[in-house]
Amino acid sequence: AHYNTEILKSIDNEWRKTQCMPREVCIDVGKEFGVATNTFFKPPCVSVYRCGGCCNSEGLQCMNTSTSYLSKTLFEITVPLSQGPKPVTISFANHTSCRCMSKLDVYRQVHSIIRR
Amino acid sequence: AHYNTEILKSIDNEWRKTQCMPREVCIDVGKEFGVATNTFFKPPCVSVYRCGGCCNSEGLQCMNTSTSYLSKTLFEITVPLSQGPKPVTISFANHTSCRCMSKLDVYRQVHSIIRR
């Protein structure tokens, strides 16, 4: 079949824009650390890079291959307010490179870490 | 309490970066349209803007207040491959503005649309 060059160009552009790579995301700090329901953070979210995007096949998953850590200072508030906001410094995982990996490899990797 | 200017500056920066606004996201086309498991798209994902980020309170949700539509042409593949890829034209909702809305208002809005 012969396809319009414009269509092929726009499809190629879509591939590039949606590929597996570090992407800026908003992390809800309370959810990320599973804190008590009466503990709140201001701001409630931070911006970090995490692997995201799509892989070319169902059996592949976009995973981080290297990680740095970013230190951010936030205010922690505990309800009822017996004292004012406390500054807390939290280290967040920041994905610096990513790769489409087989879901089986990811599973093996996670389980070998758990077994260690 | 008196807080370090640097800390306040970085917190303000975090607020700005994580606020509710249109963000570029990857949409898995097959999942978005809930198609049959033997229907695939190439590319599998497209890049559009959707509202995202954090609101200042638990009771608020980041919602779109205006939407445009982006037309994209992809290839649809049905397995087993009895014929080649077929072009499909998809009009994707692209959020152009967002607001933190009360979850109750969102619920009412959705249900008033459903009842119409």
């Epitope: - | 978005e32 349209f33 809930g34 198609v35 049959a36 539509y69 009009s91 909702a93």
Partner: nanobody, 118 residues
Framework: EVQLVESGGGLVQPGGSLRLSCAAS????????MGWYRQAPGKQRELVSA???????LYADSVKGRFTISRDNSKNTVYLQMNSLRAEDTAVYYC????????????WGQGTQVTVSS
């Protein structure tokens, strides 16, 4: 249990129109996505059109400009308006509905026959 019932199929001359509808019963929630596939004799089932509650729509290029998909969330119903019908549109048309959630579910109709012939 969710059930989908299609209607509106039939015999029509080339150039004619039909409106298919598909209604879901058994769910109080509106599906996230709804759409239509078709299967011609001896051929694979192919995607024709789909729509999401977010307003996105999909059309196979073979029907673009001739078919229009629409939905009525209050009735959990999806429609396919088919104009300028051609002989190659002859097929059994199946609707589907997709509910999102932790365990996404798809439901299918039993199919309605569309025959385009003079």
């Amino acid at each position: 249990e969710v059930q989908l019932v299609e209607s509106g199929g039939g015999l029509v001359q080339p150039g004619g129109s039909l409106r298919l509808s598909c209604a879901a019963s058994g769910s109080s929630f509106s599906p996230y996505a709804m759409g239509w596939y078709r299967q011609a004799p001896g051929k694979q089932r192919e995607l024709v059109s789909a729509t999401t509650s977010g307003g996105s729509t999909l059309y196979a290029d073979s029907v673009k400009g001739r078919f229009t998909i629409s939905r009525d969330n209050s009735k959990n119903t999806v429609y396919l308006q088919m104009n300028s019908l051609r002989a190659e549109d002859t097929a059994v048309y199946y609707c589907y509905m997709h509910w999102r959630g932790s365990d996404p579910e798809n439901y299918w109709g039993q199919g309605t026959q569309v025959t385009v012939s003079s």
